[in-house]
């Protein structure tokens, strides 16, 4: 079975960890595919290791474990994410996460950013 947080949120410009957990007494994981809606994000294979799709290579970092760290989030990243676990001999298991990217708190509060110099 696949266990995952169904709904997660993160701030625009920030990062989020996408994580699915697979548990089985008999099946072994051979490959994990991560997709943003229909678009490939990254693949992990026991034999080949990680491959991040070139479209996302500047924003997606493999890990922790078989999850992904998605960086520099934009509002357009809001949507469904799928992890697909290929197992042997158990078959294919799929998990779904809904990510809501929110405006950063600074933007929401309309705060100006000030830099204060230390007193010397």
């Amino acid at each position: 079975t696949i266990d995952t947080k169904r709904n997660i949120s993160a701030e625009e410009g920030g990062s989020v960890i996408l994580q699915c957990h697979f548990s089985s007494d008999t099946a072994e994981v051979t490959q994990v595919d991560w997709k943003q809606q229909d678009q490939l994000l990254a693949i992990y294979s026991v034999d080949l290791g990680w491959h991040v799709a070139s479209v996302f290579s500047d924003r997606v970092v493999p890990g922790p474990s078989l999850g992904l760290t998605f960086q520099s989030l934009t509002m357009n990243d809001t949507g469904e994410y799928f992890c697909t676990y290929h197992t042997y001999p158990g078959g294919i298991y799929k998990g779904r996460i809904f990510l809501k990217v929110q405006e950063s708190s600074d933007d929401r509060n309309g705060l100006a950013q000030f830099q204060t110099a230390p007193l010397g």
Partner: antibody, heavy 118, light 107 residues
């Protein structure tokens, strides 16, 4: 550097047999799924067969099922295609191909021509 | 079996032109769609994998888009070395199937 080198092609009569080999180098052969793809003269590409690296799982196109056998020897870094009961429509250039993650073909051999004719 | 239909089957274009080739799958294949370029007497070469990811070493004038059943390969500014035949291929399920090819010729 990844290299795939096919051999074993040639002229064979209908009903005859041929065994193609593909010698792989420059990568960990056992980690990859390997496929055979063919191309008849002046025609498009047709997938023939595949064998997975991790499970050894095998698949064939309907057009060759029961006549062709794909196999691999990971100790020799070699992929094989045993072709029996050959027909004129099997005439083609046969390519071996490396398929990472069972998703895309990132390397192809140069191809070997099989001609089935009397 | 999943049928892949490419269009057009051939086209004539000039250096510098923007060229678009389409590929349609007979059922949804998510993003399991790859594009290859083949020149006469040579093996095919991977251009785009997973519908939109550019293979390492391939010029950025090549791009891919689409998901589900409809996909597009675009060459933003055709170069002399781009005159070739282009194939789409689905890897959603076996048997793997290829489009019929699009031959890009010099106008």
């Amino acid at each position: 550097e990844v290299q795939l080198l096919e051999s074993g092609g040639g002229l064979v009569q209908p009903g005859g047999s041929l065994r193609l080999s593909c010698a792989a180098s420059g990568f960990t052969f056992s980690s990859y799924s390997m496929h055979w793809v063919r191309q008849a003269p002046g025609k498009g590409l047709e997938w023939v067969a595949s064998i997975k690296g991790n499970t050894g799982s095998i698949s064939y196109a309907d057009s060759v099922k029961g006549r062709f056998t794909i196999s691999r020897d990971n100790s020799k870094n070699t992929l094989y295609l045993q072709m029996n009961s050959l027909r004129a429509e099997d005439t083609a250039v046969y390519y071996c191909a490396r398929v990472p993650y069972d998703y895309w073909i990132d390397y192809w051999g140069q191809g070997t021509l099989v001609t089935v004719s009397s | 079996d999943i049928q892949m239909t490419q269009s057009p089957s051939s086209l004539s274009a000039s250096v510098g032109d923007r060229v678009t080739i389409t590929c349609r799958a007979s059922q949804s294949i998510s993003s399991y769609l790859n594009w290859y370029q083949q020149k006469p007497g040579k093996a095919p070469k991977l251009l785009i994998y997973a519908a939109s990811s550019l293979q390492s070493g391939v010029p950025s004038r090549f791009s891919g888009s689409g998901s589900g059943t409809d996909f597009t390969l675009t060459i933003s500014s055709l170069q002399p070395e781009d005159f070739a035949t282009y194939y789409c291929q689905q890897s959603y399920s076996t048997p793997l199937t290829f489009g019929g090819g699009t031959k890009v010729e010099i106008k």
